[in-house]
C-alpha cells in the first residue's frame, strides 16, 4: 500500500514538475527589465528563450521572435537545449511511469517489469529535473553577469551631459517556475526510485537461514537473466544457484510459489 502511494505520489509530483518545466520553457518572462533606475518608464521589456516582448502602459504588448539561430548567444542555445532535453526525458518518463503504476493492470505484466519501469522513469525524472535546474541556473548566472556589467556602464553619454540609461535585466517569473518545477520533477523521480525498491518481488527471507536442496537438479528463478538497468536491488538480476545460506539482512519479501524447490 505504501509502495503504491509512494509511486502514485511520485508520478503526480513529477507530472506537476514536468508541466512546470514546459510552462517555464514557453514563458516570455525569463528576464524582465530592471526598473530600479527608471521606475516610471511607460515601456516595459521582458525576454524569453524564444522571443522578446515590450509591454506599454497602454496595455499593448508587442513580441518579436528570435528568428536567427546562428546569431543567438551560445549560452541561450545551451539553455534551450537543456530545457528541451528535460522536457523530452520527462515526457518519456511520464509515459513509462503510466505503465509502471501498480494500480494499472496491463495484461500479465510482472511486478519485476513494473519495478524496472518505475526505476527507469524515476531516473528519467531525476535527469529531467536536473536539466531544468541546470538550464535555469545557467540563464540566471548569465543575467547576473550582464546585470553587473551594464551597471558598470550605466551612465555613459556625450561628455557625461546626456544620460543614456542602459536597459538592465533581472530575474523573470520563468526562472522561479523553472527552479520549482525542476525541483518537483527531481523529488518525483527520487520517490519513483524509492517505490521501485518496494515493488521488486524478492526471495522469501526466513528469520534464520534458509537452505535449498543441493543436487543435480539446479533450480533457476523464472525469468532468470532479465534485462536490467543495472540499478537497484541486485537479487532479482541474477540466477540463484544458492546451494548455501542466505543472510537475513536481505530485503524481506513475501514468498512466491517459485521460492520452494
Amino acid at each position: 500500500m505504501a509502495v503504491t502511494a509512494c509511486q502514485g505520489l511520485g508520478f503526480v509530483v513529477s507530472l506537476i514538475g514536468i508541466a512546470g518545466i514546459i510552462a517555464a520553457t514557453c514563458m516570455d518572462q525569463w528576464s524582465t527589465q530592471d526598473l530600479y533606475n527608471n521606475p516610471v518608464t511607460a515601456v516595459f521589456n521582458y525576454q524569453g528563450l524564444w522571443r522578446s516582448c515590450v509591454r506599454e502602459s497602454s496595455g499593448f504588448t508587442e513580441c518579436r521572435g528570435y528568428f536567427t539561430l546562428l546569431g543567438l548567444p551560445a549560452m541561450l542555445q545551451a539553455v534551450r537545449a537543456l530545457m528541451i532535453v528535460g522536457i523530452v526525458l520527462g515526457a518519456i518518463g511520464l509515459l513509462v511511469s503510466i505503465f509502471a503504476l501498480k494500480c494499472i493492470r496491463i495484461g500479465s505484466m510482472e511486478d519485476s517489469a513494473k519495478a524496472n519501469m518505475t526505476l527507469t522513469s524515476g531516473i528519467m525524472f531525476i535527469v529531467s529535473g536536473l536539466c531544468a535546474i541546470a538550464g535555469v541556473s545557467v540563464f540566471a548566472n548569465m543575467l547576473v553577469t550582464n546585470f553587473w556589467m551594464s551597471t558598470a556602464n550605466m551612465y555613459t553619454g556625450m561628455g557625461g551631459m546626456v544620460q543614456t540609461v542602459q536597459t538592465r535585466y533581472t530575474f523573470g517569473a520563468a526562472l522561479f517556475v523553472g527552479w520549482v518545477a525542476g525541483g518537483l520533477t527531481l523529488i518525483g523521480g527520487v520517490m519513483m526510485c524509492i517505490a521501485c525498491r518496494g515493488l521488486a518481488p524478492e526471495e522469501t527471507n526466513y528469520k534464520a537461514v534458509s537452505y535449498h536442496a543441493s543436487g543435480h537438479s539446479v533450480a533457476y528463478k523464472p525469468g532468470g537473466f532479465k534485462a536490467s538497468t543495472g540499478f537497484g536491488s541486485n537479487t532479482k538480476n541474477k540466477k540463484i544457484y544458492d546451494g548455501g545460506a542466505r543472510t537475513e539482512d536481505e530485503v524481506q519479501s513475501y514468498p512466491s510459489k517459485h521460492d520452494y524447490v
Epitope: 518608464t41 511607460a42 515601456v43 525576454q47 502602459s57 496595455g59 544620460q163 543614456t164 542602459q166 536597459t167
Partner: antibody, heavy 116, light 113 residues
Framework: QVQLKESGPGLVAPSQSLSITCTVS????????VHWVRQPPGKGLEWLGV???????NYESALMSRLSISKDNSKSQVFLKMNSLQTDDTAMYYC??????????WGQGTSVTVSS | DIVMTQSPSSLTVTAGEKVTMTCKSS????????????LTWYQQKPGQPPKLLIY???TRESGVPDRFTGSGSGTDFTLTISILQAEDLAVYYC?????????FGSGTKLEIK
C-alpha cells in the same frame, strides 16, 4: 467617429478645487487610455496625467499631490479633479485619447480661469 | 523628469522652403526591446487643439501629408517639412512618451513671411 468633449466650470476662485469631465464617444474606456493636458494662455503644452484602461494612473510630478484622475467606464466619462487652485492654473484644459502612448484624438478643450 | 529642449523657439520662412526644427531630450528615448524611439510630434494651429503628426520619432500618422518627416534616435530628433505650405503655420511640439511624466518641449513657432 471618435470624439472627446471637456466640460468644466469656466471660473474658479483661488484655493478652490476644479472638476472637469471628459465625455468620450466612438471608443471604449476599457480599451483606451485618456490623457489630460493643459495650456496656459500664450504658453506651451503641459502634460497633467493619464488614466489607463485598467484604471491605473500616472501624474505630472509637481501636481501629483493635488491632482486626481478617475473614470466611469459605463458612462464613458473621465474626470479630472485638482485642488488648491492658484492663478497660474488658469489654462485651456484638454483631454486626449491614447494610442500606443501618443495622443491621437483631442477634445476642443475647456477654458478655466482662476480668479476671485 | 526628462527635459525636452526645442530649437529654434520661432522660425520665419517663405512658403515652398524646406524647414527643419530640432528636439533634444535629456535622456535617451530609445527602447532597446523594440528599437523604437518614444518621441511624438504635434502640430497646433492657432485656436485649435494639438494634432498628432508623427509618433515613434519617424512614423507618420495617417492623413498627415508626406512633406512632414521625422527622424533621429536616442536623444536627438528632427522634424522636417520639405516644402512649406501656408497652412503649416503653427506651433510644433515634441513630447517624450517613454518615461513619466510625458513632458513636452517648449515648442517651435513657425511663421510665414
Amino acid at each position: 467617429q471618435v470624439q472627446l468633449k471637456e466640460s468644466g466650470p469656466g471660473l474658479v476662485a483661488p484655493s478652490q478645487s476644479l472638476s472637469i469631465t471628459c465625455t468620450v464617444s466612438g471608443f471604449s474606456l476599457t480599451s483606451y487610455g485618456v490623457h489630460w493636458v493643459r495650456q496656459p494662455p500664450g504658453k506651451g503644452l503641459e502634460w497633467l496625467g493619464v488614466i489607463w484602461p485598467g484604471g491605473n494612473t500616472n501624474y505630472e510630478s509637481a501636481l501629483m499631490s493635488r491632482l486626481s484622475i478617475s473614470k466611469d467606464n459605463s458612462k464613458s466619462q473621465v474626470f479630472l479633479k485638482m485642488n488648491s487652485l492658484q492663478t497660474d492654473d488658469t489654462a485651456m484644459y484638454y483631454c486626449a485619447r491614447d494610442r500606443r502612448l501618443a495622443m491621437d484624438y483631442w477634445g476642443q478643450g475647456t477654458s478655466v480661469t482662476v480668479s476671485s | 523628469d526628462i527635459v525636452m529642449t526645442q530649437s529654434p523657439s520661432s522660425l520665419t520662412v517663405t512658403a515652398g522652403e524646406k524647414v527643419t526644427m530640432t528636439c533634444k531630450s535629456s535622456q535617451s528615448l530609445l527602447n532597446i526591446g523594440n528599437q523604437k524611439n518614444y518621441l511624438t510630434w504635434y502640430q497646433q494651429k492657432p485656436g485649435q487643439p494639438p494634432k498628432l503628426l508623427i509618433y515613434w520619432a519617424s512614423t507618420r500618422e495617417s492623413g498627415v501629408p508626406d512633406r512632414f518627416t521625422g527622424s533621429g534616435s536616442g536623444t536627438d530628433f528632427t522634424l522636417t517639412i520639405s516644402i512649406l505650405q501656408a497652412e503649416d503655420l503653427a506651433v510644433y511640439y515634441c513630447q517624450n512618451d517613454y518615461s513619466y511624466p510625458f513632458t513636452f518641449g517648449s515648442g517651435t513657432k513657425l511663421e510665414i513671411k
